[in-house]
């Protein structure tokens, strides 16, 4: 067990041209805070993958207001170290992500707002118990200077915090075969109680008779490098056929449980029992709790009452991410229906609706005919946000209030003459034609293509076909 410690020395503009604008202003004073995420090994994992070695948030720094016209200086930093406790052996190689966050303290609706200012990442080798290592990382135009170290918590010592020390039993020297514990010269290395043959370089134990492996090693005695093991079946074929030096790893060999979790085999895989402060399939997630205030931008922290349980952030509309740190373009979800225009006002979403539609999301198709009467027996027809009247014969106009001239469209064919009539129109056909619209020629022999005209009507008389 031990603690990884991070000391931020400065955060400000990097060297060279293109100095960044100050993140704070007189109108928007702000303050900084930092988040560190640690992962074992030299993995190049996504920023969102679990911080398997642990994570920590700093306190908020002092409030800073930009001096008008002055270049962005190094910004005031929070006091103290960021400390990430680890319960298991220190892996020796690790990846880190350090994020610089800005908390704006202006007149935001809903109080402070947070935004990610810079994120740096790297992969390092580090022995526990060593001196502070200094580092400089750049993110865009920003530069972050920091130091870090890993130290063991008593009684653990050594480069991986796996050796145990105990106070001396005799005042002058350690017992037979036991060395003083550097740098704690007044203590002695505890007697070795690991399984016989357990690799002193790659294995360790916390209970008598066990042999637990550091990352990258496997086998009952932690003597097989994971990368060179060619035993693929759950227990590995015999060494005679594959050249494996030891039986192949079982699900718990090499202890897949991080942070001091204990592994037990299940019929199909393994199960980790995690120590207080860690959770996840492999105890890989560090115990940041709701008390640390991890939810930004008005997010509500749910669960995570103690380090044994995970927290989640329920984000207000408009934000997402595991800590509600990402602003969502809510209009990209196309919430406005029926062609409405979306406006994201920050504190609310507005839809500007097309004619004929209403409602917060333009979801209501207005009844275009409501309260609109069509005169003279016309009927109202809805459509696309406008209404129109289908008028009775002899009437026209938007509301069927205008008396229509049925002859305006010249409906009588072949030179027939049109007469308006109370129930429609009448065509007086030219000689040689007949029909309601004078559309049928009369045959030369006098026979008609249609039934003969009704009695009393000569072919040249006006005809009405109802």
């Amino acid at each position: 067990a031990g603690v990884f410690e991070l000391q931020i020395h400065s955060f400000g503009p990097g060297p060279g041209p293109g100095a960044p604008r100050s993140p704070c202003s007189a109108r928007l004073p702000c303050r900084l805070f930092f988040r560190v995420c640690l992962k074992p090994g030299l993995s190049e994992e996504a920023a969102e993958s679990p911080c398997a070695l642990g994570a920590a948030l700093s306190a908020r720094g002092p409030v800073y207001t930009e001096q008008p016209g002055a270049p962005a200086p190094d910004l005031p930093l929070p006091d103290g170290l960021l400390q990430v406790p680890f319960r298991d052996a220190w892996p020796g190689t690790f990846s880190f992500i350090i994020e610089t966050w800005r908390e704006e303290l202006g007149d935001q609706i809903g109080g402070p707002a947070w935004s990610l200012l810079a994120r740096v990442a790297g992969r390092r080798r580090l022995a526990a118990g060593g001196p502070w290592a200094r580092d400089i990382q750049r993110a865009g135009a920003w530069e972050l200077r920091f130091s870090y170290r890993a130290r063991c918590e008593p009684p653990a010592v050594g480069t991986a915090c796996t050796r145990l020390c105990r106070p001396r039993s005799a005042p002058s020297r350690c017992g037979p075969g036991l060395r003083p514990c550097a740098p704690l010269e007044d203590e002695c290395e505890a007697p070795l109680v690991c399984r016989a043959g357990c690799s002193p370089e790659h294995g360790f134990c916390e209970q008598p008779g066990e042999c637990r492996c550091l990352e990258g090693w496997t086998g009952p005695l932690c003597t097989v490098p994971v990368s060179t093991s060619s035993c693929l079946s759950p227990r590995g074929p015999s060494s005679a056929t594959t050249g494996c030096l030891v039986p192949g790893p079982g699900p718990c060999d090499g202890n897949p449980c991080a942070n001091g979790g204990s592994c037990s085999e299940t019929p199909r895989s393994f199960e980790c029992t995690c120590p207080r402060g860690f959770y996840g399939l492999r105890c890989e997630v560090s115990g940041v709790t709701c008390a640390d205030g991890p939810c930004f931008n008005g997010g509500l922290c749910v669960g995570g009452a103690d380090p044994d349980s995970a927290y989640i952030c329920h984000c207000p509309p408009g934000f997402q991410g595991s800590n509600c740190e990402k602003r969502v373009d809510r209009c990209s979800l196309q919430p406005c229906r029926n062609g409405g225009l979306c406006l994201d006002l920050g504190h609310a979403l507005r839809c500007r609706c097309r004619a004929g539609f209403a409602g917060p999301r333009c979801e209501h198709d207005l009844d275009d005919c409501a309260g609109r009467a069509c005169a003279n027996g016309g009927t109202c027809v809805e459509g696309g946000g406008a209404h129109r009247c289908s008028c009775a014969l002899g009437f026209g106009g938007r509301d069927c209030r205008e008396r229509a001239d049925p002859c305006a469209a010249r409906p009588c064919a072949h030179g027939g003459r049109c007469y308006a009539h109370f129930s429609g129109l009448v065509c007086a056909c030219a000689p040689g034609y007949m029909g309601a619209r004078c559309e049928f020629p009369v045959h030369p022999d006098g026979a008609s293509a249609l039934p003969a005209a009704p009695p009393g009507l000569r072919p040249g008389d006006p005809q009405r076909y109802l």
Partner: antibody
């Protein structure tokens, strides 16, 4: 402006299920989280739980085993069901909208008194 | 859960006076996620302050909020007759959301 109206029976028998509905007007139910809060006569306000249009819910642990809050986006309504009620559940029940900048309550219904009695 | 304790329980004052109401949290309320409400008899609560110090829409500027961490206050600079009501604080830092039990402001 968002307006909320609670509806449901004012009298429920012990051991039965209390059911209330809140109808939202002046705002889309898809824009906010929606919550229920209660206040026993002469006592403190108690948060019951909330729902988001996506179906996300969160309940007060003291009531979690008995509470269900659901949302009906087509009707712009959300509802509360509280099972196995006792006289201690007698209260004015309020529905409220949760603000878009944090989990506080910016609009409230006028409240409906539910009495648990046989 | 965060327990909010409001004091005093009841306060008798006259119109025109200045009043300060206290809300103390059992644990730190991060990010000033604290709101204040006013409840008049027979009515629903009404939002006054959010983010510990931001006034809600339509709230007169005689109402102001302050504080951080575990100690928060609501101040009414000059009491009007309609201000006599019960005032509640509520934290929205973590679940469960919790209210204080209120301070009743009555006319002396």
């Amino acid at each position: 402006q968002v307006q909320l109206q609670e509806s449901g029976p004012g009298l429920v028998k012990p051991s039965e299920t209390l059911s209330l509905t809140c109808t939202v007007s002046g705002g889309s139910i898809s824009s906010y989280y929606w919550s229920w809060i209660r206040q026993p006569p002469g006592k403190c306000l108690e948060w019951i739980g909330y729902v988001y249009y996506s179906g996300t819910t969160n309940y007060n642990p003291s009531l979690k085993s008995r509470v269900t809050i659901s949302v009906d986006t087509s009707k712009n309504q959300f509802s509360l069901k509280l099972s196995s009620v006792t006289a201690a559940d007698t209260a004015v029940y309020y529905c409220a909208s949760i603000a878009v900048t944090g989990f506080y309550f910016d609009y409230w219904g006028q409240g409906t008194l539910v009495t648990v009695s046989s | 859960e965060i327990v909010l304790t409001q004091s005093p329980g009841t306060l008798s004052l006259s119109p025109g006076e200045r009043v300060t109401l206290s809300c103390r949290a059992s644990q730190r309320v991060n990010n000033n996620y604290l709101a204040w409400y006013q409840q008049r008899p027979g009515q629903a609560p009404r939002l006054l302050i959010y983010g510990a110090s931001s006034r809600a829409t339509g709230i007169p500027d005689r109402f102001s909020g302050s504080g951080s961490g575990t100690d928060f206050t609501l101040t009414i600079s000059r009491l009007e007759p309609e201000d006599f009501a019960v005032y509640y604080c509520q934290q929205y830092d973590r679940s469960p959301l919790t209210f204080g039990c209120g301070t009743k402001l009555e006319i002396k």
